[in-house]
């Protein structure tokens, strides 16, 4: 399994002068997908730091795909960046921060956090894996920077969220993540495998996120849920291209590597974004 | 095996309240991995999405914000059906209602048989 | 909201042909889309989720593809059943909205 022929490599901080990126996805490579379409679409260039056209076959591919080039602009340039200044003045909270925590219509069980308006915290809940509301992080520290108050009663982001452009979309956008991994992909990549109420024994494959990797399993026939895929390559395509590695600047990281990866310097921390 | 059976009058008057209810078989309207809804279905509007509740330890709703000031979707545990309350109807919420349920995937996977609802005085 | 728009709005085939119905969101959607089949006097019936997912008991002719914002279903030889009108629904995010339709007609 070549999958497992990974060298290990130091990787350390850059050159580059900070680009500062409102979405993880901007940083990921163009990608024109398995079809045969011509559709002219708009991706970000994490080098030329610029919106620019590529042809896209017409399905899969990521989300650094813009229909036009002022769309691109707006999702992926820095002039555009929603920011919330640090600042002695009181900050507004967003409004999804009053709103109460929302599990959202699926079955996938995701531990999310929310802000509690009660409370003036940011607490732990499950997230069923679509919609819901905006009322959803990652993570408590990206929680607490949007949401909660600082010590004096301030807002304390010096960079805010810029929530997906879809209102109570599948999966709020974060701009910070502290975790080493950060998933960008379909949310059910993260669910369990689910063999499903019926009795027969079909090979399947699912996305085991705790290893990063597809892994076989048998499938009833029916039920079950979304993390399951007819081919090794369908999983590998719809949830590994999800992954972004991160590491925090001027740090050091033993990780593992396959293929080249692009490197570019994002806010205060690196993002190694794999070419799949 | 799932179904739905929907209930509830014809002919509505303006202004007044329009009220559905959906009965339940084969899944519980409590249930933590559906999700029950209403959609109605008109010429001029084609399927329009009107409102969602599930449970998931306790009660939540999103509705259309076309019509968010006037519906109300409740469930009824004891029955095992949920309902539809639209208030101050006029001639343009005609149309035939569905109740539906949404699976864990998200989808509406089992739907009633629709009620035509005409708003008429 | 997110508008979901069908192509064409109607069309004519014969038994055993291939036929292509689209759908186009005004946003991305990623995969969250389901393709419905509504024959006259019925209820809608779930095709397709996950914009390639095929529900349990769904003939495998019918087919669907696509993420981001532009969708295709695919019914690969059609049979005198298959008559009827397709609706596409996003899942994305509230409200959750359908297209606006495509009948399939007997040329």
């Known amino acids: 399994d070549s999958e497992e022929d990974e060298e290990h490599t130091i990787i350390t901080d850059t050159e580059l002068p900070p680009l500062k990126l409102m979405h993880s996805f901007c940083a990921f490579k163009a990608d024109d997908g398995p079809c045969k379409a011509i559709m002219k679409r708009f991706f970000f260039n994490i080098f030329t730091r610029q919106c620019e056209e590529f042809i896209y076959g017409g399905c899969e591919g990521n989300q650094n795909r813009f229909e036009s080039l002022e769309e691109c602009k707006k999702m992926c340039t820095r002039d555009n960046a929603n920011r919330i200044i640090k600042t002695t003045l009181q900050q507004e909270k967003p409004d999804f921060c009053f709103l109460e925590e929302d599990p959202g219509i699926c079955r996938g069980y995701i531990t999310r956090y929310f802000y509690n308006n009660q409370t003036k915290q940011c607490e732990r809940f499950k997230y069923g894996g679509c919609l819901g509301n905006m009322n959803n992080f990652e993570t408590l520290e990206e929680c607490k920077n949007i949401c909660e108050d600082g010590p004096n009663g301030f807002q304390v982001d010096n960079y805010g969220t810029q929530l997906n452009a879809v209102n109570n979309s599948l999966t709020p956008q974060s701009t910070k993540v502290p975790s080493l991994f950060e998933f960008h992909g379909p949310s059910w990549c993260l669910t369990p495998a689910d063999r499903g109420l019926c009795r027969a024994n079909e090979n399947r494959f699912y996305y085991n996120s705790v290893i990063g990797k597809c892994r076989p399993f048998k499938y009833s026939g029916c039920g079950g849920n979304e993390n399951n895929f007819t081919s090794k390559q369908e999983c590998l395509r719809a949830c590994k291209k999800g992954f972004i590695q991160r590491i925090s600047k001027g740090g050091l990281i033993k990780t593992k590597r396959k293929r080249k990866k692009q490197r570019v310097k994002i806010a205060y921390e690196e993002i190694f974004v794999k070419n799949m | 095996q799932v179904q739905l059976q929907q209930s509830g009058p014809g002919l509505v008057k303006p202004s007044q309240t329009l009220s559905l209810t959906c009965a339940i078989s084969g899944d519980s309207v409590s249930s933590n991995s559906a999700a029950w809804g209403w959609i109605r279905q008109s010429p001029g509007r084609g399927l329009e999405w009107l409102g969602i509740?599930?449970?998931?330890?306790?009660?939540?709703?999103h509705y259309a914000v076309s019509v968010k000031s006037r519906i109300t979707i409740n469930p009824d545990t004891s029955k095992n059906q949920f309902s539809l309350q639209l208030n101050s109807v006029t001639p343009e919420d005609t149309a035939v209602y569905y109740c539906?349920?949404?699976?864990?995937?998200?989808?509406?996977?089992?739907w009633g048989q629709g009620t035509l609802v005409t708003v008429s005085s | 909201d997110i508008q979901m728009t069908q192509s064409p709005s109607s069309l004519s085939a014969s038994v055993g042909d291939r036929v292509t119905i689209t759908c186009r969101a005004s946003q991305d959607i990623r995969n969250n889309l389901a393709w419905y089949q509504q024959k006259p006097g019925k209820a809608p019936k779930l095709l397709i989720y996950?914009?390639?997912s095929l529900q349990s008991g769904v003939p495998s002719r019918f087919s669907g593809s696509g993420s981001g914002t532009d969708f295709t279903l695919t019914i690969s030889s059609l049979q005198p059943e298959d008559f009827a009108v397709y609706y596409c629904?996003?899942?994305?995010?509230?409200?959750?909205?359908f297209g606006q339709g495509t009948k399939v007609e007997i040329k």
């Open positions: 996950a914009a390639s």
């Open positions: 629904q996003q899942r994305n995010g509230f409200p959750l909205t």
């Open positions: 509740i599930y449970y998931r330890s306790k009660w939540y709703n």
């Open positions: 539906a349920r949404s699976n864990w995937s998200g989808y509406f996977d089992y």
